[in-house]
Amino acid sequence: HSDGIFTDSYSRYRKQMAVKKYLAAVLGKRYKQRVKNK
C-alpha cells in the first residue's frame, strides 16, 4: 500500500478506468446478444 499523494490519485483513476472498461464490456456483450437474438 502506498501513502504517496501522486499514487493515491492515480490508483483512483485506474479503478475508474477498470470500472468503465468492465461496464463497456458488459454493455457491449448485452448489445451483441440483442442483435444476435433479432
Epitope: 502506498s2 504517496g4 499523494i5 490519485s9 492515480y10 485506474r14
Partner: antibody, heavy 115, light 110 residues
Framework: QSVEESGGRLVTPGTPLTLTCTVS????????MIWVRQAPGKGLEWIGI?????DTYYASWAKGRFTISKTSTTVYLKIASPTTEDTATYFC????????????WGQGTLVTVSS | DVVMTQTPASVSEPVGGTVTIKCQAS??????LLWYQQKPGQPPKLLIY???TLASGVSSRFKGSGSGTEFTLTISDLECADAATYYC????????????FGGGTEVVVK
C-alpha cells in the same frame, strides 16, 4: 531511506546516456518516482514519472526524448539523443507521502553535453 | 500540459518582514499544488502539499493558500535562513496534465 542518482558525465551530442537512481529503505512497488532536471542557473523542469505499477508519463516536451524504467530497487532515465540543451543536473525523487508528510530527493547527477 | 506561472521572479525583504509569492495555473488544478524551497547546490525541499498542508518539520511561518488556478505562498517573520528560491508544482491528474513547476521566485533577505 535514501535516493541516489549516478551516471552523469560529459557526453558528445547524440550519444545515448542512461542515468541511474538507486533507492533504499522503501519499496518502488509502493511509490511513484519522478525525474526532474535543472540547467545551470535555471529553474526546475519536470521530465516524467513512473508509478508503482510501472506506468510512465512524460512532460510534452520530453516525450520521445526520454525513457523512464525501473527494477525492484532502481529507476532509470534514458536520454535517447542528448543535445547541448540537455546539459543539467538531473534529480530523482520519491513522491510526497500524505502520512509521512515528506518526499525524498537525491543530490542530483550532472550531465554535460558538449562536442 | 498545465502551465504554472509564478510571480515575482525575485523579491527582497528585510529580516522580520513578509514575502508573498503567487502561482497561477493555466487551468483548474483544485488543491493539487506543492511548494518547494531550494538553496544553491541542494535539491528542493518540500514545504507544503495539497496547497495548504505543511510538510513534516516545516516552520509554521510558511503558509500556503488558494485553490483552482490561484495559489499563494506567504513567508512571515523572515529569517536569513529563508533566503532561497521557491517553486510551485502542479500534480493534478499528472497522467494527462503533467507536473510542471513554476519558474521560481528568488527570495533575498536583507
Amino acid at each position: 531511506q535514501s535516493v541516489e542518482e549516478s551516471g552523469g558525465r560529459l557526453v558528445t551530442p547524440g550519444t545515448p546516456l542512461t542515468l541511474t537512481c538507486t533507492v533504499s529503505g522503501f519499496s518502488l512497488s509502493s511509490y511513484a518516482m519522478i525525474w526532474v532536471r535543472q540547467a545551470p542557473g535555471k529553474g526546475l523542469e519536470w521530465i516524467g514519472i513512473i508509478y508503482d505499477n510501472g506506468d510512465t508519463y512524460y512532460a510534452s516536451w520530453a516525450k520521445g526524448r526520454f525513457t523512464i524504467s525501473k527494477t525492484s530497487t532502481t529507476v532509470y532515465l534514458k536520454i535517447a539523443s542528448p543535445t547541448t540543451e540537455d546539459t543539467a543536473t538531473y534529480f530523482c525523487a520519491r513522491e510526497p507521502g500524505s502520512t509521512t508528510q515528506n518526499d525524498l530527493w537525491g543530490q542530483g547527477t550532472l550531465v554535460t553535453v558538449s562536442s | 500540459d498545465v502551465v504554472m506561472t509564478q510571480t515575482p521572479a525575485s523579491v527582497s525583504e528585510p529580516v522580520g518582514g513578509t514575502v508573498t509569492i503567487k502561482c497561477q495555473a493555466s487551468e483548474n488544478i483544485y488543491n493539487s499544488l506543492l511548494w518547494y524551497q531550494q538553496k544553491p547546490g541542494q535539491p528542493p525541499k518540500l514545504l507544503i502539499y495539497r496547497a495548504s498542508t505543511l510538510a513534516s518539520g516545516v516552520s509554521s511561518r510558511f503558509k500556503g493558500s488558494g485553490s483552482g488556478t490561484e495559489f499563494t505562498l506567504t513567508i512571515s517573520d523572515l529569517e536569513c535562513a529563508d533566503a532561497a528560491t521557491y517553486y510551485c508544482q502542479n500534480y493534478y491528474n499528472i497522467w494527462t496534465n503533467g507536473a510542471a513547476f513554476g519558474g521560481g521566485t528568488e527570495v533575498v533577505v536583507k
